[in-house]
């Protein structure tokens, strides 16, 4: 805590400028009016203040706005934002997307800090849902943002926002998250024609059920192996050899290289060996000819 001392004669700051970098901590505290600082916050980013001086400037703003800074100040915090704690940020009411963008810009190119995570959380909660413009902004700065949300949080994403999602935004999503996103994507892209629809839905297919994969197999989509390997195992298992062949098209040859990995391995174990042989890929591990396959899950459902 900086002691309250009188400002030396002639040192009272009339504006926020570079002369202030020569002020000692106590001089900054005594000679810079907090209201002046608040109105000229945008100038701070062009002045090479020391870390200690930034602490003093933050302290002055904290005294002026004990309940939290107004948005007019927040928008111009610049690198002083990085001196804020999550507790400070929880006091803020950020409603403008421009303010959010300005603060995200400060940390651009670096992983999400606790300050940024708190800011985003406050902003999204304030809006009530993750609208398209917000999602656009957040994924532009943090491609992995969507996959950092819980399935519960993702449920508040309106289908219209899905248009803002790029394939790389889903790279780190797990199956539970894709389970939530896939139905939204299906709804968002429902009016597109076959090939265009597949291009858009492809990144979300890790959440697709069997019946949707069967439908896609009838549309000559030529799914690549990387996408196939991300499908839910439980959704792939019921597919027939013919359906997988149609789904993958010319990429079906890639199954051989993946035969020891899920979901291919588990799918092979469920197919008749003579059906697998029709692919001519030398896939082994299918059900030998002459064996009877009982679907116990169906039996349990009937009893």
């Amino acid at each position: 805590e900086v002691e309250k001392t009188a400002c030396p004669s002639g040192k009272k700051a009339r504006e926020i400028d570079e002369s202030l970098i020569f002020y000692k901590k106590w001089e900054l505290e005594a000679c810079v009016d907090a209201a002046l600082l608040a109105t000229q916050m945008d100038r701070v980013n062009a002045i090479p203040f020391t870390y200690e001086q930034l602490d003093v400037l933050k302290h002055k703003l904290d005294e002026l706005y004990p309940q939290g800074y107004p948005e007019s100040v927040i928008q111009h915090l610049g690198y002083l934002f990085l001196k804020m704690s999550p507790e400070d940020i929880r006091k803020w009411n950020v409603t403008s997307l421009e303010t959010l963008k300005a603060l995200l810009e400060v940390n651009k190119g670096h992983e999400m800090s606790p300050q940024v995570a708190t800011l985003i959380d406050r902003f999204v909660k304030g809006r009530g849902q993750l609208d398209k413009d917000t999602l656009d902004t957040l994924t532009a700065f943090y491609p992995g943002y969507l996959c950092s949300l819980s399935p519960e949080e993702l449920s508040s994403v309106p289908p219209s926002s899905i248009w803002a999602v790029r394939p790389q935004d889903l790279d780190t999503c797990d199956p539970r998250q894709l389970d939530v996103l896939y139905p939204k994507a299906r709804l968002a892209f429902q009016n597109m024609n076959g090939s265009e629809y597949f291009v858009k839905i492809q990144s979300f297919l890790g959440g697709a059920p069997t019946e949707d994969l069967k439908a896609l197999s009838q549309q000559n989509v030529s799914m690549d192996l990387a996408t196939f390997m991300k499908l839910r195992t439980d959704a792939v298992l019921p597919l027939t050899v013919a359906e997988v062949q149609k789904l993958l098209g010319p990429h079906v040859e890639g199954l051989k290289a993946e035969e020891r990995h899920r979901p291919v391995r588990d799918w092979i174990l469920r197919q008749r060996q003579d059906d697998l042989d029709t692919l001519g890929l030398g896939l082994q591990g299918g059900i030998p000819n002459g064996y009877l396959v009982l679907d116990l899950s169906m039996q349990e459902a009937l009893s």
Partner: antibody, heavy 119, light 107 residues
Framework: QVQLVESGGGVVQPGRSLRLSCAAS????????MNWVRQAPGKGLEWVAV????????YYADSVKGRFTISRDNSKNTLYLQMNSLRAEDTAVYYC????????????WGQGTLVTVSS | DIQMTQSPSTLSASVGDRVTITCRAS??????LAWYQQKPGKAPKLLIY???SLESGVPSRFSGSGSGTEFTLTISNLQPDDFATFYC?????????FGQGTKVEIK
């Protein structure tokens, strides 16, 4: 006067870990930011990481992100660099250097410690 | 990250010469640029900061200029002690990237 002394360098096998230290004196350590910069044999300078005075913010070069961790103990006036999953290309002299603010240059440097990653 | 490109990579000069080294940033860095001098086996030494401000104790024959993306370091009257490698570094972003260096050697 300002003094920065690095230690902890040595020969280490690829994939292993090493922790470098930098002991600071002659200035108020808790007031200033600290950086690690490295220089591979016969090559130029490469900035590695920075940590703000209070440890609240840390930034890394893409080449070390996820493998190296910068930290500091202000009570001991010491800066650290924890290096995991080391690779041959991490072989370099590692310098610690001070900055006084986000828009300040590196005004004081240590003499460096050599890290050799080799099997 | 901001890329810094220095030229030339090597410069041959004689004592008394005026030498100029150029540094170009991949995007505007305002005036947040420093120049360092490094001698073999030694740590770098800060010469100039904020593009043109001379660090305390550095001889006045060293000067810097430029802003935005184009910067120069000039040594007006090269001395025997000046033969070394010089680096520029931007500090406009938290990832403080260096140029690849310019070696000033005796002609």
């Amino acid at each position: 006067q300002v003094q920065l002394v690095e230690s902890g360098g040595g020969v280490v096998q690829p994939g292993r870990s090493l922790r470098l230290s930098c002991a600071a004196s002659g200035f108020t350590f808790s007031s200033d930011g600290m950086n690690w910069v490295r220089q591979a044999p016969g090559k130029g300078l490469e900035w590695v990481a920075v940590i703000w005075n209070d440890g609240s913010n840390k930034y890394y070069a893409d080449s070390v992100k996820g493998r190296f961790t910068i930290s500091r103990d202000n009570s001991k006036n010491t800066l650290y660099l924890q290096m995991n999953s080391l690779r041959a290309e991490d072989t370099a002299v590692y310098y610690c250097a001070r900055d006084r603010g986000p828009l300040w240059p590196l005004d004081y440097w240590g003499q460096g410690t050599l890290v050799t990653v080799s099997s | 990250d901001i890329q810094m490109t220095q030229s030339p990579s090597t410069l041959s000069a004689s004592v008394g010469d005026r030498v100029t080294i150029t540094c170009r940033a991949s995007q505007s860095i305002s005036r947040w640029l420093a120049w360092y001098q490094q001698k073999p086996g030694k740590a770098p030494k800060l010469l100039i900061y904020k593009a043109s401000s001379l660090e305390s104790g550095v001889p006045s024959r060293f000067s810097g200029s430029g802003s935005g993306t184009e910067f120069t370091l000039t040594i007006s009257n090269l001395q025997p002690d000046d033969f070394a490698t010089f680096y520029c570094q931007q500090y406009a972003s938290y990832s403080r990237t260096f140029g690849q260096g310019t070696k000033v050697e005796i002609k």
